[in-house]
């Protein structure tokens, strides 16, 4: 039950931090202009990783994407990759994940296999979210460096009484949202982590005894095969009750402690 | 045909109070951010408040800040400026504009006559 | 505050020649998000509200005649009317339309010489 809860509430966090990397790589404000000399403007600028926009006071905004892929500054170049693997290792890692859940039966699966797709994706998860950190902190550091760099060019263009004043920027909301959802992203892979070591089965191995209906002579075969997931897939071992022959099929009446409800 | 038209301008005396209508018509009203600009007798313009769409972006020249107050009530097409504490230098025509791209007034209204005289 | 300064304040040219009204600003109204001039011409005739003629620094507001154009970037600007005729006869303001307040020029007075 608490592997379950543990798998489940993993799945969750992770996707809900996936649905916030995704959010917050299409989202316009990574940098946002900074408003401490101006704090009045009637224009606001404000940069995502794919567009410039400009909101006006009249509630016009404009916004340009950036057409040119050489023209884009490396670090740009390389947080858009890191947000875009995050995505798709999270997506890939979700898609897994479905199927590794202990609440979804899906044909005759095992649960070692469970087990190790539950690992996969939270090996994933985890991937994702330090992308997803990684970018949102490379973004972030371009930001403080270009801020502390114009800062120190701010009035180097005042000549008498015209003032050139160098527009800074500052973190924009989406920085806060990438990096949230990439540790939901990541305690979401821990989970799934944590969730594979409950789901790894017990190697316990279970005599089948085999009695045939004259009752003359008993075989004793050392066990080995665990017990069916109750999908019938067994059928070449045959195990005899009570004196009656009948195959594995018709025995798994009831469901025992290692089928999927 | 886009209108705005003001009302509530008078002779008013120092230190007194006056609260200036604009009644709104021809264009969706919440849709944009209003203004109101003044011109004292045989001077320039001078821009006195902004009010956007929803209201919850208000600016104010220095000059009145914290004398006057931009209102609006969207149901009723309708902008205001409640002005206290009247000065002399306060006399001047008031105009009321529609705010629009650009950050620019692209209808005006005919303006009402506000008089702080004693 | 952005302090905006119109020369000359007056002017008087003759029909259909060329008048040439200059504003500079304290500081940039060029915003580098959009590489727009946050620059806004005015024309207002006697016992008439303001009309706007220019935004952005050179765009042309709907209706206007194209005799009228607007030019400059970051702190000087221009409007020009290519050919005067009677009806311009006005004072023209320029606006800073970039931060608040949005201060206006002292305004420049066009007549026929």
């Known amino acids: 039950m608490a592997v379950t809860a543990c798998q489940g509430l993993g799945f969750v966090v992770s996707l809900i931090g996936i649905a916030g990397i995704i959010a917050a790589t299409c989202m316009d404000q990574w940098s946002t202009q900074d408003l401490y000399n101006n704090p009045v403007t009637a224009v606001f600028n404000y940069q995502g990783l794919w567009r410039s926009c400009v909101r006006e006071s009249s509630g016009f905004t404009e916004c340009r994407g950036y057409f040119t892929l050489l023209g884009l500054p490396a670090m740009l170049q390389a947080v858009r990759a890191l947000m875009i693997v995050g995505i798709v290792l999270g997506a890939i890692g979700l898609l897994v994940s479905i199927f590794a859940l202990k609440c979804i039966r899906i044909g005759s699966m095992e649960d070692s296999a469970k087990a190790n797709m539950t690992l996969t994706s939270g090996i994933m998860f985890i991937v994702s979210g330090l992308c997803a950190i990684a970018g949102v902190s490379v973004f972030a550091n371009m930001l403080v460096t270009n801020f502390w760099m114009s800062t120190a060019n701010m009035y180097t263009g005042m000549g008498g009484m015209v003032q050139t004043v160098q527009t800074r920027y500052t973190f924009g909301a989406a920085l806060f949202v990438g990096w949230v959802a990439g540790g939901l992203t990541l305690i979401g892979g821990v989970m799934m982590c944590i969730a594979c070591r409950g789901l790894a089965p017990e190697e316990t191995n279970y005599k089948a005894v085999s009695y045939h209906a004259s009752g003359h002579s008993v075989a004793y075969k050392p066990g080995g095969f665990k017990a069916s997931t109750g999908f019938g897939s067994n059928t070449k071992n045959k195990k005899i009750y009570d004196g009656g022959a009948r195959t594995e099929d018709e025995v798994q009446s009831y469901p025992s402690k290692h089928d999927y409800v | 045909e886009v209108q705005l038209v003001e009302s509530g301008g008078g002779l008013v005396q120092p230190g007194g109070s006056l609260r200036l209508s604009c009644a709104a018509s021809g264009f969706t009203f919440s849709d944009y951010g209003m203004a109101w600009v003044r011109q004292a007798p045989g001077k320039g313009l001078e821009w006195v408040a902004f009010i956007n769409n929803l209201a919850y972006s208000i600016y104010y020249v220095d000059t009145v800040t914290g004398r006057f107050t931009i209102s609006r009530d969207n149901a009723k097409n309708s902008l205001y400026l409640q002005m206290n504490s009247l000065r002399a230098e306060d006399t001047a025509v008031y105009y009321c504009a529609r705010f629009t791209t650009g950050n620019v007034m692209d209808y005006w209204g005919q303006g009402t006559l506000v008089t702080v005289s004693s | 505050d952005i302090v905006m300064t119109q020369s000359p304040d007056s002017l008087a040219v003759s029909l259909g020649e060329r008048a040439t009204i200059n504003c500079k600003s304290s500081?940039?109204?060029?915003?580098?998000?959009?590489?727009?001039?946050?620059l806004t011409w005015y024309q207002q005739k006697p016992g008439q509200p303001p009309k706007l003629l220019i935004y952005?620094?050179?765009t042309r507001e709907s209706g206007v005649p194209d005799r009228f154009s607007g030019s400059g970037s970051g702190t000087d600007f221009t409007l020009t009317i290519s050919s005067l005729q009677a009806e311009d006869v006005a004072v023209y303001y320029c606006q800073n339309s970039y931060s608040y307040p949005l201060t206006f020029g002292g305004g420049t007075k066009v007549e026929i010489k």
């Open positions: 500081q940039s109204l060029l915003q580098g998000g959009n590489q727009k001039n946050y």
């Open positions: 952005w620094s050179s």
